[in-house]
Interface confidence: low
């Protein structure tokens, strides 16, 4: 089995997570791609996806999540704007290839969002803060109903602190994945 690795990304409330996921250009350029959260003891849940077929450089917005697929470069760009502490968790990019299982793009992203302290010396002044300009031409895409199956082992008690995301039906919960994976290995 492929060893799962994750990268930790620490941001403050109100900032923007800006992730890029690489994929094999020739194989997946026009395939539908998705951004998923992996909750303890559950199958990955799709939060947002590109259109099908995926359009080049065409922003898709679902709530606070914006996806842009750069076909020419084999990159899916994912942004989560105006981050909240409850957004902390484990995320991944996948490529939908029905009827086959979704293809996971490495690495998974461990997002840790902490309370921001406005005006604190040393705070990241240059990073994107609460005010974020969404591209004017965005599309809200419908994602396939299925999620990638996963072996579920001894699911721990789930957090009940779900937070609704504006403009969408998704929830982001402060959870960690049951699979323990090395960071930077």
């Amino acid at each position: 089995a492929t060893k799962l690795t994750e990268e930790k990304y620490e941001l403050k409330e109100g900032q923007t997570l800006d992730v890029k996921c690489d994929y094999t250009l020739e194989k997946f350029a026009s395939s539908q791609k998705a951004w998923q959260i992996i909750r303890d003891g559950e199958m990955p849940k799709t939060l947002a996806c590109t259109e099908r077929p995926s359009k080049n450089s065409h922003p898709v917005q679902v709530g606070r999540i914006i996806l842009e697929d750069y076909h020419d470069h084999g990159l899916l760009r994912v942004r989560m704007v105006n981050l909240q502490v409850e957004d902390s968790g484990l995320y991944q990019c996948v490529i939908y290839q029905p009827p086959k299982e979704p293809h996971m793009l490495f690495d998974r992203i461990r997002l840790v969002v902490t309370k921001g302290f406005s005006g604190t010396p040393g705070s990241n002044e240059n990073s994107t803060q609460n005010v974020y300009k969404i591209p004017p031409t965005t599309t809200k895409a419908l994602c396939p109903l299925y999620t990638s199956p996963r072996t579920v082992t001894q699911a721990p008690p789930k957090s009940t602190a779900d937070v609704s995301t504006p403009d969408s039906e998704i929830n982001l919960t402060n959870v960690t994945d049951i699979i323990r994976v090395p960071v930077f290995n």
Partner: antibody
Amino acid sequence: QVQLVQSGAEVKKPGSSVKVSCKASGGTFNRYAFSWVRQAPGQGLEWMGGIIPIFGTPNYAQKFQGRVTITADESTSTAYMELSSLISEDTAVYYCASSHFYGSGSSNYYYYGLDVWGQGTTVTVSS
Amino acid sequence: DIQMTQSPTSLSASVGDRVTITCRASQGISSWLAWYQQKPEKAPKSLIYAASSLQSGVPSRFSGSGSGTDFTLTISSLQPEDFATYYCQQYNSYPYTFGQGTKLEIK
């Protein structure tokens, strides 16, 4: 792996501008993030700013904001750094450096740090 | 801005010695730290990325460790070519700041 070749040494008058180029070869230009770092004589390294050509928007250190412009030209695989309103304290060696971000699936475009450096361009500001 | 503080600022050692240089960040930077080696009149060379990963082609006597705010660069057995200045750099958030450098000299 990419190689970075910078433009030659420059002598400039105070108040003028300098534009240093950094040509990348041996790699796919849009798979790299580029930074500009300077080093005054006998001093340490100072990060001025950076750009990820595929996304276009540069980031600058506050100290240089309004005086530095970092651009990238995909058609020629070249990154540029222009510094205006030069003063004698801008006399330094200016380095471009790149970070390869292909294949890591990374949430940080500089995942590998500044793994390749140009040879440096000496800029002397003198009246 | 995140301040990076290296210690010591200079260090005298002999060939074969084990040497440790430390770098402290003014706030947490996860593992987004790199180490560079610079020799006089030369461009810096990358040694370590992501706090502990060795760049391709760098000898295994170099190693890095740490996360959050405290990091170390260790040279297990100094070689003549290792006498140089070493810099740490955080790339957790803009601007990507460097430490002030540690000059490693022959005793």
